[in-house]
Interface confidence: low
């Protein structure tokens, strides 16, 4: 969690002298409570923004608007503490908007926004604001909070933010995977324009179970330059295992912006659907051979073989 | 000009603790994978932990599992390694190094020395 | 977890010599596999990555090969400024082992 570095933050308007101050999210009137306090935020809505860094990076924001409630309690309004909480890290940050003048109503309801939160794809966030000075112990709570949940790296606009083009978001390698028989698979995929290895993971499992009956991992050497952005192909073999069926494979990428952590993709193929009689599997009859050039590759392990071949 | 620059070495008992800090310039740190490699006197290089470069993946040699924590401050551009219940085997120069795109550390700091003596 | 060997532990040669290391791993590694160069007193220096190719910057006397589980680095004619510890290291999964070392020094 940290704040848009891209310029002074500001929280002043019209009739309201404002400066928005780092928090530690204990604000002081926890500590020296104050018997009048202002009542809670109205109408808090959390929206995705996108916005740019001074070196031009776009990244997600988190866009927090309340107005203020029409009630005389905005004499004793001080100022408000935004907080954003990331839910699977229990990391939080503050911000406190200090007011520097005294509210007074006038014709339009007061309304407050707020769009420095930079926030990361598909997790999510608890944004509370907290009006001040804070209630006593005991007293009427007097701040609101949502839960905001940011779309992953598929999502249209995030896919071009920086933080999902370091992860490899612009790369879509169109998997298709084809049963050639009972004992070999075909992947097809199309190369990113990066001269980097990847690895096709397959994961194997009986028909409507979760536990896998069989797992092989594939490397793919590094493409050359005029191999990007062709189909590249995999012919995989699978371990001859009744009712191990249901084939899931997994590209991961290791592209320089992301190495170990880069997305990945996968495909599914489901098991088949059974004849009423049972039709005889006829011997293999392989429906695509290795060109001159491409390499067979036999898993350590020995858990599953496979070949694969880079179209131009 | 890439650079990593460790600090937080000294001199440490047994059972004591020690935070290692990386701080990385000269290439955009958010995007890279880190590791800590040690290397005890007159001894050869040994891994110590890994992590990814939105802190997603971690992981740590078997020697030093439970003991230390690996973490990054992508906005301080920095790398850290918090070293808990010290041992005497502990006592090396540690590096941080940044992996290369196909495998490797291309990037190494200069070292950091640590040493774990009563 | 994989275990790397390196052999020999030391070696001398003369200069113009060729020089082979050789590292082995317990299990196949494919080419995730790194060699590294460390003079006394300094930080180590990648040389190798995916098993054959050179880092950029590093004189072409310097090759690796190999696949697998047998690895091996060649200095095609040593030279003085050669004189360092030599380092494997596997990276397909951590734990991200190195070998032992080999050290050369000149006769």
């Known amino acids: 969690l940290r704040l848009l570095d891209h310029r002074a933050l500001v929280c002043s308007q019209p009739g309201l002298n404002c400066t928005v101050k780092n928090s530690t999210c204990l604000d002081d009137s926890w500590i020296h409570p104050r018997n009048l306090t202002p009542s809670s935020p109205k109408d808090l809505q959390i929206q995705l923004h996108f916005a740019h860094t001074q070196q031009g990076d776009l990244f997600p924001v988190a866009h927090i608007e309340w107005t203020l409630q029409t009630d005389a309690s905005i004499l004793y309004l001080e100022g408000a503490e935004l907080s954003v909480l990331q839910l699977n890290t229990n990391e939080r940050l503050c911000v406190r908007f200090e007011f520097l003048s005294k509210l007074r109503h006038h014709h339009r309801r007061w309304r407050f926004t707020f769009s420095h939160f930079v926030v990361d794809p598909d997790q999510e966030y608890e944004v509370t604001v907290h009006h001040l000075p804070k209630p006593i112990p005991d007293g009427d709570p007097n701040h609101q909070s949502k839960n905001f949940l940011v779309p992953d790296c598929e999502h249209a606009r995030m896919k071009v933010t920086t933080p999902c083009m370091s992860s490899g978001s612009l790369w879509d390698p169109n998997i298709t995977v084809e049963t050639l028989d009972t004992q070999h698979l075909r992947v097809d995929f199309t190369l990113w324009n990066e001269s980097t290895h990847y690895q096709i993971l397959l994961t194997s499992f009986p028909h409507m179970e979760n536990h896998s009956c069989f797992e092989h991992m594939h490397h793919i050497p590094a493409p050359r330059p005029e191999e990007f952005h062709q189909r590249s192909n995999v012919t995989l073999t699978l371990r001859n295992l009744k009712g191990c069926c249901r084939h899931q494979v997994q590209i991961q990428p290791f592209f320089s912006s992301c190495l170990n952590d880069c997305l990945r993709h996968s495909a599914t193929v489901s098991c088949p659907e059974m004849p009423d009689t049972p039709e005889p599997i006829p011997d293999y009859m392989p429906l695509w051979e290795p060109r001159s050039g491409s390499s067979d590759y036999k898993d350590d392990d020995d858990k599953g073989s496979s070949h694969h071949h880079h179209h131009h | 000009e890439v650079q990593l620059v460790e600090s937080g070495g000294g001199l440490v008992q047994p059972g004591g603790s020690l935070r290692l800090s990386c701080a990385a310039s000269g290439f955009t740190f958010s995007s890279y994978s880190m590791n800590w490699v040690r290397q005890a006197p007159g001894k050869g290089l040994e891994w110590v932990s890994f992590?990814?470069?939105?802190?997603?993946?971690?992981y740590y040699a078997d020697s030093v599992k439970g003991r230390f924590t690996i973490s990054r401050d992508n906005a301080k551009n920095s790398l850290y390694l918090q070293m808990n219940s010290l041992r005497d085997e502990d006592t090396a120069v540690y590096y941080c190094?940044?992996?290369?795109?196909?495998?490797?550390?291309?990037?190494w700091g200069q070292g950091t020395t640590v040493t774990v003596s009563s | 977890d994989i275990q790397m060997t390196q052999s020999p532990s030391s070696l001398s040669a003369s200069v113009g010599d060729r020089v082979t290391i050789t590292c082995r791993a317990s299990q196949g590694i494919s080419n995730y596999l790194a060699w590294y160069q460390q003079k006394p007193g300094k930080f180590p220096e990648l040389l190798i990555y995916a098993a054959s190719t050179l880092q950029s910057g590093v004189p072409s006397r310097f090759s690796g090969s190999g696949s697998g589980t047998d690895f091996t680095l060649t200095i095609s004619s040593l030279q003085p400024e050669d004189v360092a510890t030599y380092y494997c290291?596997?990276?397909?999964?951590?734990?991200?082992?190195f070998g032992p070392g080999t050290k050369v020094d000149i006769k």
């Open positions: 992590i990814s470069a939105r802190s997603s993946t971690i």
């Open positions: 190094a940044r992996p290369k795109v196909g495998g490797g550390m291309d990037v």
């Open positions: 290291q596997k990276y397909n999964r951590a734990p991200f082992t």
